[in-house]
């Protein structure tokens, strides 16, 4: 498999058959698949060097792994997008052997003197062809030469099989399955041959191709493949339940932010709640996690403005649940990214020198910002797309707080909507879905560069649009939701999560 290890070294060779038998639309589809693969790999913070070859009668090398920009995913994608099927029109035979020899030439080193670290570099060849080679001879001989070069299968104690993966995608109207199978790697419990039909569900294909065991602690990563559970798609999501004898129970959501902490809303708890009465589950697991302590933001005080006629005051409505035992990360349990951390800098593929302010400008620009939250409907987690009103609609969004029960007599809305809040909901630019009571404490998320970054904690809403946890179809335009802006509570997060190795900026 493609081992995505951010500390490892990898070369990926993209080889695309542009011969007559492929056809323009299949060529375009294959290109799209490769573009998606480049993005998927880049989302892991891995920066492999890419080689890019198209071929028919002759190969054309568009990107060499030795080029300085070969590890710049955006640049490689640009080169790939600029390739046309017509480029091989005049010499449109199929010489797969020559194309693989072009890959071999990129792998090999001058004067037979291997560079430092050559033996730690993994090589991945992704060949998109119909397998109908009609000139140049059998391409399998070049695969053998490549194996020889990389010293694969020669040492009984160290076969190095994981240093070469050859994936073959059968593209085109007619595919020679025998030839394709012969070229692809053969490894136990792994799939290295894919058909055109597979390319309709690329996430499923990538799931078969990628080994992310070295990057399970990466924040904001998800798997969207068809066989995945809700928690493959939202692996940070935590369900919180507070059992109160003779008073029923309160349901909330939260987000895994580190191996020991779940971030949620403070209002989910009262000062009387004992740790043993708080149930937290993650990854869709039945068992509850043991809780060490709930840490409230020191400035949170729901009764803080009762004298001023404000019955409930949600400023600083955030809490961290500290778990007794370390979470074991896996594909259904992994953290979400937090603002102003090194992990988020890497997730957004920003320079290491990026400041907290620059992250804020990237994630919360002064405009309508596409975001999402996760809600549970009929025991299924679903993503709800909303827009954070952070530009010209911000004022009107915040003013609608006056329609919230108990806030009708508030003279100045900034008394309840403090600078700590982000506002979503309403009908412009689109009709946003609203949060339900049980969504409280869950993350408000910005999805960027294939990663998920939490920017807010769901706190309170103007209108209860959910009857029995079912959203009403028709909701008033003033149905707004307010979320604690994590950029505004960073000092507290930084202090409480200082031992969690999140690398706060």
């Amino acid at each position: 498999k493609i081992v995505l290890d951010p500390s490892g070294s990898m070369n990926i060779y993209l080889v695309l058959d542009g011969s007559d038998s492929i056809g323009a639309s299949n060529f375009t589809g294959a290109k799209k698949c490769l573009v998606n693969l480049i993005e998927k790999v880049a989302s892991y913070g891995v920066k492999p060097r890419y080689g890019l070859v198209t071929y028919a009668t002759y190969p054309k090398i568009w990107v060499k792994v030795s080029e300085a920009d070969s590890s710049n995913a955006d640049w490689v994608t640009k080169q790939l997008n600029e390739i046309n099927y017509e480029d091989h029109k005049l010499k449109s035979g199929t010489n797969t052997k020559k194309a693989l020899q072009a890959v071999y030439s990129m792998m090999s080193w001058p004067d037979d003197v291997p560079p430092e670290g050559w033996n730690r570099t993994r090589h991945v060849i992704i060949l998109m062809t119909d397998g109908l080679h009609n000139m140049g001879g059998d391409p399998i001989t070049v695969i053998d030469e490549i194996r020889d070069l990389l010293y694969i299968g020669k040492d009984r104690k160290n076969p190095r099989e994981d240093y070469l993966d050859v994936y073959v995608f059968g593209v085109g109207p007619l595919v020679n399955q025998v030839n394709i199978n012969a070229l692809a790697s053969k490894k136990d419990n792994e799939q290295h041959v894919f058909k055109v039909k597979d390319m309709e569900n690329l996430e499923d294909v990538f799931y078969q191709m990628i080994d992310e065991s070295q990057s399970l602690s990466l924040c904001g990563m998800v798997w969207e493949h068809r066989k995945g559970t809700d928690y493959h798609k939202q692996p940070w999501q935590a369900k919180i339940s507070v059992i109160r004898p003779s008073k029923g129970h309160e349901s909330c959501m939260g987000a895994v932010v580190s191996e020991y902490f779940v971030l949620t809303a403070a209002h989910c708890f009262t000062v009387d709640d004992k740790e043993h009465s708080i149930k937290v589950s993650v990854g869709g697991e039945k068992r509850d996690l043991e809780i060490e302590v709930v840490l409230f933001h020191p400035n949170y005080n729901i009764n803080g403005k009762k004298e001023a006629g404000i019955p409930e005051f949600y400023d600083y409505d955030v809490a961290l649940i500290k778990l007794k035992n370390k979470l074991k990360y896996g594909q259904t349990i992994r953290p979400i990214c937090l603002p102003c951390t090194e992990g988020t800098t890497r997730a957004l593929r920003l320079p290491p020198t990026t400041t907290c302010q620059q992250q804020k400008e990237e994630l919360l620009p002064a405009q309508d910002i596409k975001a999402l939250f996760v809600s549970e409907e009929e025991k299924k987690l679903t993503r709800k797309e909303v827009y954070i009103k952070n530009g010209d609609k911000k004022g009107s969004c915040e003013r609608d707080a006056q329609y919230a029960p108990g806030y009708d007599k508030v003279k100045d809305i900034s008394e309840v909507v403090t600078p700590r809040f982000l506002c979503t909901g309403g009908v412009s630019p689109y009709a946003d879905p609203n949060t339900c009571r049980g969504d409280s404490g869950g993350p408000l998320i910005v999805h960027k560069r294939s990663r998920f970054i939490q920017v807010g904690v769901i706190s309170w809403g103007v209108v209860d649009v959910c009857k029995n946890q079912k959203r009403q179809k028709q909701v008033p335009a003033h149905a707004r939701d307010f979320h604690i802006n994590l950029f505004q509570v960073l000092p507290w997060l930084k202090e409480k999560l200082q031992d969690e190795d999140l690398g706060f900026l």
Partner: antibody
Framework: EVQLVESGGGLVQPGGSLRLSCGTT????????MSWVRQAPGKGLEWLGF??????????EYAASVKGRFTISRDNSKNTLYLQMNSLKTEDTAVYYC????????????WGQGTLVTVSS | EIVLTQSPATLSLSPGERATLGCKAS??????????MNWYQQKPGQAPRLLIY???NLESGIPARFSGSGSGTDFTLTISSLEPEDFAVYYC?????????FGQGTKLEIK
């Protein structure tokens, strides 16, 4: 055809030095471990050390009895293995063999004919 | 280091007889499903010759009357029917752990 030929043996005084060479042909030298083995008169075989193949950067390994006194090196451009022997003792008198150590099964599948080293005053 | 003890030190047999040579290791020479034990034959004035590798695999060009068996710490070289040219010294050698080591040898002589 695989061939290994040792050279450089001879008479040397105790405390002296000697460098043995092992020229090879018929195989891709850099892809193999290469070992030195010796045999004292009337005694058994004693493994002295090897030079690993290219994946391991040709790093050497030594038997405790010669560590610090003997050095194994190779010149891949000349397909030649070397054994530099320093501070020689009378008990180092032996026939010295070089052998190709096949990493496909970690066994010495080809041997040279041997070269005699006599340490005597 | 792994110490290899061969038995017997000397074995006197006649041509046509079956020879069984033993080799015991001070610790296991198995790794990842393979036994890294090799057998060599040496005749006077000649370099050793590989007979068996990885405990039971016959090196190419070696007659089929030679066979090897065993795993872990106990290994056997068997010559099913001795030919006159088989009388020589036989060494076992382990390549599982560095440093490699040889047994002291078994001398197979004509009775």
């Amino acid at each position: 055809e695989v061939q290994l030929v040792e050279s450089g043996g001879g008479l040397v005084q105790p405390g002296g030095s000697l460098r043995l060479s092992c020229g090879t042909t018929g195989f891709t030298f850099r892809d193999y471990y290469m070992s030195w083995v010796r045999q004292a008169p009337g005694k058994g075989l004693e493994w002295l050390g090897f030079s690993r193949h290219r994946v391991y950067g040709y790093t050497p390994e030594y038997a405790a009895s010669v560590k610090g006194r003997f050095t194994i090196s190779r010149d891949n451009s000349k397909n030649t293995l070397y054994l530099q022997m320093n501070s020689l003792k009378t008990e180092d008198t032996a026939v010295y063999y070089c052998a190709r150590d096949n990493p496909g099964y970690y066994a010495m599948d080809y041997w040279g004919q041997g070269t005699l080293v006599t340490v005597s005053s | 280091e792994i110490v290899l003890t061969q038995s017997p030190a000397t074995l006197s047999l006649s041509p046509g007889e079956r020879a069984t040579l033993g080799c015991k290791a001070s610790q296991s020479v198995d790794y990842d499903g393979d036994s890294y034990m090799n057998w060599y034959q040496q005749k006077p004035g000649q370099a050793p010759r590989l007979l068996i590798y990885a405990a039971s695999n016959l090196e190419s060009g070696i007659p089929a009357r030679f066979s090897g068996s065993g795993s872990g710490t106990d290994f056997t070289l068997t010559i099913s029917s001795l030919e006159p040219e088989d009388f020589a010294v036989y060494y076992c050698q382990q390549s599982n752990a560095d440093p490699y080591t040889f047994g002291q040898g078994t001398k197979l002589e004509i009775k």
